[in-house]
Interface confidence: medium
């Protein structure tokens, strides 16, 4: 049925889906607070621009009776049920902020006539790539793949003189939502990562992973996994590791590595951690701007979703353009807007760009140090530490295949 959008005559509403099944176990109250904080900022920005309009959010909660797994497994139906709720109420905002699970976003995108933009904090999977009216404010799997391929091919840095073409991927099925889709993308036989690698095997059992660490007949020295240091320790423990093994630990949404008092445990010495640059968030508190810290990336993505809507609303209103048009629905991409803690860039397909940071453990200081950074917007790697104090021989990353060239 035709749903009218509450999106004109100076009154602009945001529909926020508050789903029980979510990419991250963040209390819905925190997400509400993030949205409300975003609304305050948007109202201020619109007022400063001389635009006397009303912007509000409507929170749409599911009943939680059927879809109560808490994770993303039953999110497909929950998302569609919430859309049905909107349809029955005959009321939709200018924009839909909500589904974070890949399953629900994919299905909702398929099953709705999207004449309005959809903003997601999540939807990491490749199946949500290249969607014309979907914007994703947390790094999707495609961005991770492009970094990995770029890094694998790099061979002209003082600390990486070999191109790599092989990898093991550890994926045991217990991963968080982000990790599940990141590893899913690496596993997929038709993905860019698989296409560019000559050898790739998925390890699904703890024992398979543990055996590879000292297996003289292993086909690759590189193992990719996803999670935090504790996750790695549970799996690896204090087992001996061959000296030319490199574990790439994908842990994008974790700021702990940048905290001053953090010391890297010994089991991290063979590990390169891939995380996101903390951006401006560590700097805000030193300035007189009275911004309450929204540390978690998930809640921050909700907040930035509100700010993105405010940014687009301001542009369209200043240009005298209609908000309830396909042009508005397709406009949430290829732009930079002022996020809560700095500029946020969206690529041509509405996916957030960011600075990924590859960290190593200094054998001297036992601290995490930045080895290089990678700008997803320009697909470019920038070396930072040209003479890292690695655990690996000659302070260089080994070849990915044992016995191929000098180690």
């Amino acid at each position: 049925s035709q749903v009218s959008q509450n999106c004109h005559n100076g009154s602009y509403e945001i529909s926020v889906l508050m789903m029980g099944n979510s990419a991250f176990a963040e209390p819905l109250k925190n997400l509400e607070d993030a949205v409300n904080e975003g609304l305050e900022i948007v109202r201020g920005r619109l007022q400063n621009a001389g635009l006397n309009v009303t912007v509000n959010a409507t929170f749409m909660y599911s009943d939680g009776l059927i879809h109560n797994s808490g994770d993303c497994r039953s999110s497909t139906c929950e998302g569609l049920d919430l859309l049905r709720k909107i349809s029955n109420a005959q009321r939709m905002g200018c924009v839909l902020i909500g589904p974070s699970c890949t399953y629900s976003t994919f299905q909702m995108y398929l099953d709705t006539e999207l004449s309005y933009p959809m903003i997601s904090a999540g939807s990491f999977g490749l199946s949500c790539d290249y969607k014309e009216t979907l914007t994703r404010l947390m790094s999707p799997a495609r961005k991770l793949m492009y970094f990995l391929v770029n890094f694998w091919k790099t061979n002209d840095l003082p600390f990486k003189t070999y191109s790599w073409s092989t990898s093991y991927v550890y994926k045991n099925g217990t991963e968080t939502e982000d990790c599940f889709w990141y590893l899913n993308a690496l596993e997929a036989s038709v993905s860019y990562f698989s296409h560019e690698l000559g050898f790739k095997v998925v390890l699904r059992q703890d024992k398979e992973f543990q055996d590879i660490l000292m297996d003289h007949n292993r086909k690759s020295n590189v193992i990719i996994m996803c999670g935090g240091p504790e996750f790695l320790y549970k799996l690896k423990g204090d087992r001996a590791v061959a000296e030319d093994i490199v574990i790439i630990l994908v842990d994008l949404f974790n700021d702990q590595y940048f905290e001053d008092n953090v010391t890297a445990p010994d089991y991290m010495k063979n590990v390169l951690v891939l995380t996101l640059s903390p951006g401006n968030s560590l700097l805000n508190s030193s300035f007189s701007r009275n911004l309450s810290p929204t540390k978690r990336d998930f809640a921050l993505a909700y907040l930035n979703g509100i700010l993105l809507f405010g940014h687009m609303l301001k542009i369209f209103l200043e240009n005298g353009e209609n908000i309830t048009t396909p042009k508005f629905a397709h406009a949430f991409r290829n732009l930079t807007f002022e996020g809560y803690d700095g500029p946020v860039t969206l690529d041509d397909w509405g996916d957030v760009d960011s600075t990924m940071v590859l960290l190593y453990t200094s054998v001297d200081t036992k601290k995490y140090k930045v080895l290089l950074t990678y700008d997803t917007h320009v697909n470019k790697t920038y070396p930072v530490d040209m003479s890292p104090t690695f655990t690996w021989k000659n302070s260089k990353l080994p070849n990915d295949i044992t016995g191929r060239g000098p180690q």
């Epitope: 940048f258 640059s277 903390p278 951006g279 401006n280 560590l282 700097l283 930079t336 002022e338 700095g342 500029p343 860039t345 600075t355 940071v357 140090k369 930045v370 950074t373 700008d375 917007h377 320009v378 470019k380 920038y382 070396p383 930072v384 530490d385």
Partner: nanobody
Framework: QVQLVESGGGLVQPGGSLRLSCAAS????????MSWVRQAPGKGLEWVAK????????YYVDSVKGRFTISRDNAKNSVYLQMNSLRAEDTGVYYC????????WGQGTTVTVSS
Amino acid sequence: QVQLVESGGGLVQPGGSLRLSCAASGFTFSRYWMSWVRQAPGKGLEWVAKIKYDGSEKYYVDSVKGRFTISRDNAKNSVYLQMNSLRAEDTGVYYCATDFTRDVWGQGTTVTVSS
């Protein structure tokens, strides 16, 4: 390689002025906020000022508001700090920093305010 090179420090009398410069290389300068940070003798680091990637927003720590001005020239990959009405408490080593990565620091430039 990511590099930041500061210059322009020196000895100046109270009430005097200095202009600090920072030349950046090895990253897409025009996409990142830049900051000036200082370390007074025997003290910790203090964030002084920061500027948005396009120069349209600037923030200052309270103690320098109205006296210091941060600016940038994206064509030259440079950020500047114009310091007027200098006081003895502004003495220290001044560093520029980028939100691109926290691990890169220049050698700093020393500012001494003394009569």
